[in-house]
Interface confidence: low
């Protein structure tokens, strides 16, 4: 939905076009409960609370109201070169029985948080991927967002600042480090099946072989690249299902923890591998505790309800020092009907080899 704040002479100073999903934890008499709901289509800008700001006293704010007393507020600020949603706040009324059935208290609660929504002055902020803002007991996820404050001509600028999540992430193998010590190449890793289930059934099915490609400095100051296979027989799998995030956590030998995070683009209904985190121990390394993470990947993409399949080896670069080689991957996230893989979307590598 589009939300606009105008000043006294009718010129727009804030324009925002987004959909939003709310996840709220609250107490009922029978214990804690989580409710998820979307910003309804009849949500409106509260004109007497929203503001274009005053030169010396306040900054622009967008206040959106819906339901029985819920308001979402975006407070903007700027410096010399950039503006941002410095603070997002959400007021919710637990007496709204449509949204919060059986709430044990009927109070009005307010939560707030800083955000990473920011853009260059005279550019719009654009984020197709979900932007999550975590507050106390509440998570707000903005989808397919276009936002701009401090407008100069009552319309979105042509130029845009893209959010971190939308920026492309290379999925090629990392470049070889300067003259690393050679490392014996292990065989291809064994392929294993993984599944993650939640209260609504299976949210992740995966079949793949996993190999870690690690570059690190040894105690003798030499740089080495090692390939480590994840052995399914020595790996415990767990995970979690969420409306916008599905995780697969693998605990393997050598105190290795490998975490995969799958995200979903609601506007295009596609899932993708969004993040990888690794914690492991390398006994011969100068710093034995090896940690790496990247939460803005774009790999293994397919339409929700379909599966992604690739027989060719895929290299997913996580950091300069760490990539994951994925063998014979077949994966489906979020929507898995009957515990079976859906229609297959082949990777480009396979299509090119056909």
């Amino acid at each position: 939905a589009m939300f606009i704040v105008k000043n006294g002479n009718g010129t727009a100073c804030i324009m925002a076009n987004f959909s939003a999903a709310f996840s709220v934890n609250y107490d009922t008499k029978s214990g804690p409960k989580n409710m998820t709901f979307d910003l309804p289509s009849d949500a409106k800008v509260v004109l007497n609370s929203s503001s274009c700001g005053k030169e010396n006293t306040s900054d622009p704010s967008l206040v959106i109201a819906f339901g029985r007393g819920q308001t979402l507020t975006l407070n903007f600020t700027r410096n010399a070169t950039r503006y941002s949603v410095q603070l997002m706040s959400f007021v919710y009324n637990l007496s709204d029985t449509h949204l919060f059935p059986n709430a044990s208290s009927k109070e009005i609660k307010t939560v707030e948080s800083i955000t990473d929504i920011r853009a260059d002055i005279d550019k719009k902020y654009r984020c197709v991927s979900g932007t999550q803002v975590h507050m106390n007991n509440v998570t707000v996820t903005l989808h397919d967002a276009t936002i701009q404050a401090y407008l100069s001509n009552s319309s979105f600028s042509r130029e845009e600042t893209r959010c971190e999540q939308d920026r492309p992430s290379p999925t090629t193998a990392p470049p070889a480090p300067p003259s690393p010590s050679p490392s014996p190449v292990p065989e291809s890793p064994s392929v294993d099946k993984y599944n993650v289930s939640g209260t609504n059934g299976t949210c992740l099915l995966a079949s793949m072989g996993l190999q870690l490609n690690l570059t690190y400095e040894r105690k003798d100051n030499t740089t080495v690249t090692r390939l480590l296979n994840i052995n399914p027989n020595k790996t415990l799998a767990s995970g979690s299902c969420g409306a916008h995030l599905v995780t697969l956590e693998l605990h393997s030998e050598g105190s290795t923890v490998l975490l995969f995070q799958f995200g979903m683009n609601a506007s295009s209904s596609r899932f993708f591998l969004q993040g990888i985190q690794l914690n492991t121990t390398l006994p011969d390394a100068r710093d034995p505790a090896f940690k790496a993470a990247n939460s803005s990947l774009r790999a293994l993409q397919a339409t929700v309800g379909n599966s992604y399949k690739c027989n060719a080896e895929e290299h997913v670069r996580v950091t300069k020092a760490f990539s994951v080689n994925i063998f014979k991957v077949w994966v489906q996230a979020f929507k898995v009907e009957g515990g079976q893989f859906g229609s297959v979307e082949e990777c480009l590598l396979d299509e090119n080899n056909m």
Epitope: G53, K54, E55, N56, T57, S58, D59, N75, T77, R78, N79, A80, T81, Q86, L87, E112, S113, I114, T115, D116, T131, Q132, V133, H134, M135, N136, E164, S295
Partner: antibody, heavy 122, light 111 residues
């Protein structure tokens, strides 16, 4: 009350890495940015950057971008800074501090940890 | 990067007198009527402490002896009257743009 408890002093060799922690208590961790500031012996203060625990994204002073990695663990309300490829120039006290948003009056660092001293010596 | 120049580098003031510290920015730290300049106190062996935010606003719990003023590029920090407990180094800091920068500090001593 708000408290930022930093990890103990570190002694490291040149070329090594160190990882320091800053455990926050007394407030909602994800509602504020966590900043890191460096102070060399007898010198002034240098801003390294901050981590936003809500979104998981860091923002770096370009001067420190290749030297430091800022992270956080929301489950334990703890922020981390890792210094890589240590040299004698990295010998300093490193402070974590909370970024507080004063509405239109901007951000300032309203609470500070006690600092972690890093000594790089062969 | 915005450079903040503090003066004097050190200052000796008698108890009960006024101490004044200046901070000059290489470019304006005002925008839209807001000033992104703050002042901190650091006592020997301790962490910095926020005293003044946004040029002139006293942080909660800070005595009214401390005050700040200024806009644009020129700022002043004042302690009146000075007490023995005020022996410390005082820093100005801007965050109108990244990277945030601090002044070089002013060391306050008692005469």
């Amino acid at each position: 009350q708000v408290q930022l408890q930093q990890s103990a002093a570190e002694l490291a060799r040149p070329g090594a890495s160190v990882k320091m922690s800053c455990k926050a208590s007394g407030y909602t961790f994800t509602s504020y940015t966590m900043h890191w500031v460096k102070q060399r012996p007898g010198q002034g203060l240098e801003w390294i950057g901050y981590f936003n625990p809500s979104s998981g994204y860091p923002e770096y002073n370009q001067k420190f971008k290749d030297k430091t990695t800022l992270t956080a663990d929301k489950s334990s309300n703890t922020a981390f800074i890792q210094l890589n490829s240590l040299t004698s120039e990295d010998s300093a006290v490193y402070y974590c501090s909370r970024g507080y948003y004063y509405g239109s009056r901007g951000y300032a660092l309203d609470f500070w940890g006690q600092g972690t001293s890093v000594t790089v010596s062969s | 990067n915005i450079v903040l120049t503090q003066s004097p580098a050190s200052l000796a003031v008698s108890l009960g007198q006024r101490a004044t510290i200046s901070c000059r920015a290489s470019e304006s730290v005002d925008i839209n009527g807001n000033t992104f300049m703050h002042w901190y106190q650091q006592k020997p062996g301790q962490s910095p402490k926020l005293l003044i935010y946004a040029a002139s606003n006293l942080e909660s719990g800070v005595p009214a002896r401390f005050s700040g003023s200024g806009s644009g590029t020129d700022f002043t920090f004042t302690i009146d009257p000075v007490e023995a407990d005020d022996v410390a180094t005082y820093y100005c800091q801007q965050n109108i743009e990244d990277p945030w920068t601090f002044g070089g500090g002013t060391k306050l001593e008692i005469k």
